[in-house]
């Protein structure tokens, strides 16, 4: 939560914005509201962006004002032009994309004064549901040595990675996770736990996404001697 | 080149199914929202389907439970299953991608629902 | 749901005469979601204009988006005769996600 006031001596008014993660391939809202004014034509809403020239989005006089927009926010920003008059500035930018990431700024005018106050919006694509793969899949003993693989795919930033077993006793030991960027700069995570198998063992991998706090589960359970496994097992 | 080619389209019973393609080239698919947009004979756009670069669907009431929009990543390929189907989805139907606006279209595929 | 009612429905005019082509929204649509679209026989839409003034890539100054709020506008400021077509208005962002206008029918006159 932040909560600015303006720099004009008495003429200030308080303006607050929470910091907040946007879902890559969606509509977000960054947040802002401020002290009300009774007169909607009074009122003047900026959003900037830090490192860009242009305006994200102006609301002046009851109406957008696009004129001064920067290119990379054209045909994308809104805000709520009724709820405008009981102090919401907030903004919602549709199809946000990676490079919307950044320090906004919520800047108010009023017929009480100015105010101002910054936004830190991040973003984040949620990983999807982890497929599990075991190797070898058939003819498996208690003793034998095998590799997991938990793959989960199109997230954004990149993962945590977190192993446990059916008691969520975490597993840190003989874990490799590597990351791939798509061509969309979205990663792919593949997670691989070698381990001693026991008599029965559930093992389970969770995929955190740490902007959105989105956790995508996948586990395996190999039973019962001898076994057959299939390729894909999820959760 | 960007562009969309619709596919799929035909002559279809009432109560029939059908599955419309659309495939894109020049650009991803997953990245953008897409959208399918339908025209009656004779009659204005009417917006059907919408899925979001995260996978998020919405549908316009006409058609909310008769049709799934889907789409196929590896193939850069947005589809719309439609079951049920009535007279009055006799239609031309349009795949269009919607940046700031809907600022490339397909060249439609029809469908006529008769009897 | 938000209706966009655009008039008149049938607009008859000479080539070099202006257009005046009008959108009006049953409540507030943001500037930045509303867009024009032009139509031919036989062809697909074309958009025109986005954000309610930005003109597409392609699309000769003749035309022009203004208005805010409830009220917008598409100006042909000098009619070739390639512009006589079905135009669009359209929103995004309320439910239903997009909503088009009924279209208004630009002929020769």
């Known amino acids: 939560l932040i909560i600015g006031f303006g720099i004009s001596g008495r003429h200030s008014i308080t303006v607050t914005t929470v910091a907040s993660a946007g879902n890559i391939g969606e509509d977000g809202i960054l947040s802002c509201t401020f002290e009300p004014d009774i007169k909607l034509s009074d009122i003047v809403i900026q959003w900037l962006k830090e490192g860009v020239l242009g305006l994200v989005h102006e609301f002046k006089e009851g109406k957008d004002e696009l004129s001064e927009q920067d290119e990379m926010f054209r045909g994308r920003t809104a805000v709520f032009a009724d709820q405008v008059i009981v102090g919401n500035a907030s903004l919602r930018l549709k199809n946000v994309q990676l490079t919307d990431a950044g320090t906004y700024k919520c800047y108010i005018i009023t017929s009480k004064g100015k105010g101002n106050a910054n936004l830190e919006y991040k973003t984040g694509a949620p990983y999807s549901k982890p497929s599990m793969t075991l190797e070898p899949n058939k003819d498996l003993r208690p003793g034998d040595t095998v590799t997991i693989t938990c793959s989960s795919y199109r997230g954004y930033p990149e993962a945590e990675v977190f192993w446990q077993d059916g008691q969520g006793v975490p597993l840190t030991g003989n874990v490799t996770t590597s990351q791939m960027a798509n061509e969309q700069g979205l990663f792919d995570v593949h997670s691989v736990l070698r381990v001693v198998l026991g008599a029965n063992g559930t093992y389970s991998c969770l995929v955190r996404n740490p902007v959105l706090q989105q956790d995508a589960h996948g586990s395996v359970t190999i039973t019962g001697q001898p076994m057959t496994f299939p390729p894909e097992a999820l959760w | 080149e960007v562009q969309l080619v619709e596919s799929g389209g035909g002559l279809i019973q009432p109560g029939g199914s059908l599955r419309l393609s659309c495939a894109a080239s020049?650009?991803?698919?997953?990245?953008?929202?897409m959208n399918w947009v339908r025209q009656a004979p004779g009659k204005g756009l009417e917006w059907v389907s919408v899925?979001?670069?995260?996978?998020?669907?919405y549908y316009a009431d006409s058609v909310k439970g008769r049709v799934t929009i889907s789409r196929d990543n590896s193939k850069n390929t947005l589809y719309l299953q439609m079951n049920s189907l009535r007279a009055e989805d006799t239609a031309v139907y349009y795949c269009?991608?919607?940046?700031?606006?809907?600022?490339?279209w397909g060249q439609g595929t029809t469908v006529t629902v008769s009897s | 749901e938000i209706v966009l009612t655009q008039s008149p429905g049938t607009l008859s005019l000479s080539p070099g005469e202006r257009a005046t082509l009008s959108c009006r929204a049953s409540q507030s649509v943001s500037s930045s979601y509303l867009a024009w679209y032009q139509q031919k026989p036989g062809q697909a839409p074309r958009l025109l204009i986005y954000?309610?003034?930005s003109r597409a890539t392609g699309i000769p100054d003749r035309f022009s988006g203004s208005g805010s709020g409830t009220d917008f506008t598409l100006t042909i400021s000098r009619l070739e005769p390639e512009d006589f077509a079905v135009y669009y208005c359209?929103?995004?962002?309320?439910?239903?996600?997009?909503?088009f206008g009924q279209g208004t029918k630009l002929e020769i006159k």
């Open positions: 269009a991608r919607d940046t700031y606006a809907m600022d490339v």
């Open positions: 020049g650009f991803t698919v997953s990245s953008n929202y």
């Open positions: 954000g309610a003034s």
């Open positions: 359209q929103q995004y962002g309320s439910s239903p996600m997009y909503t």
């Open positions: 899925i979001y670069g995260s996978g998020r669907t």
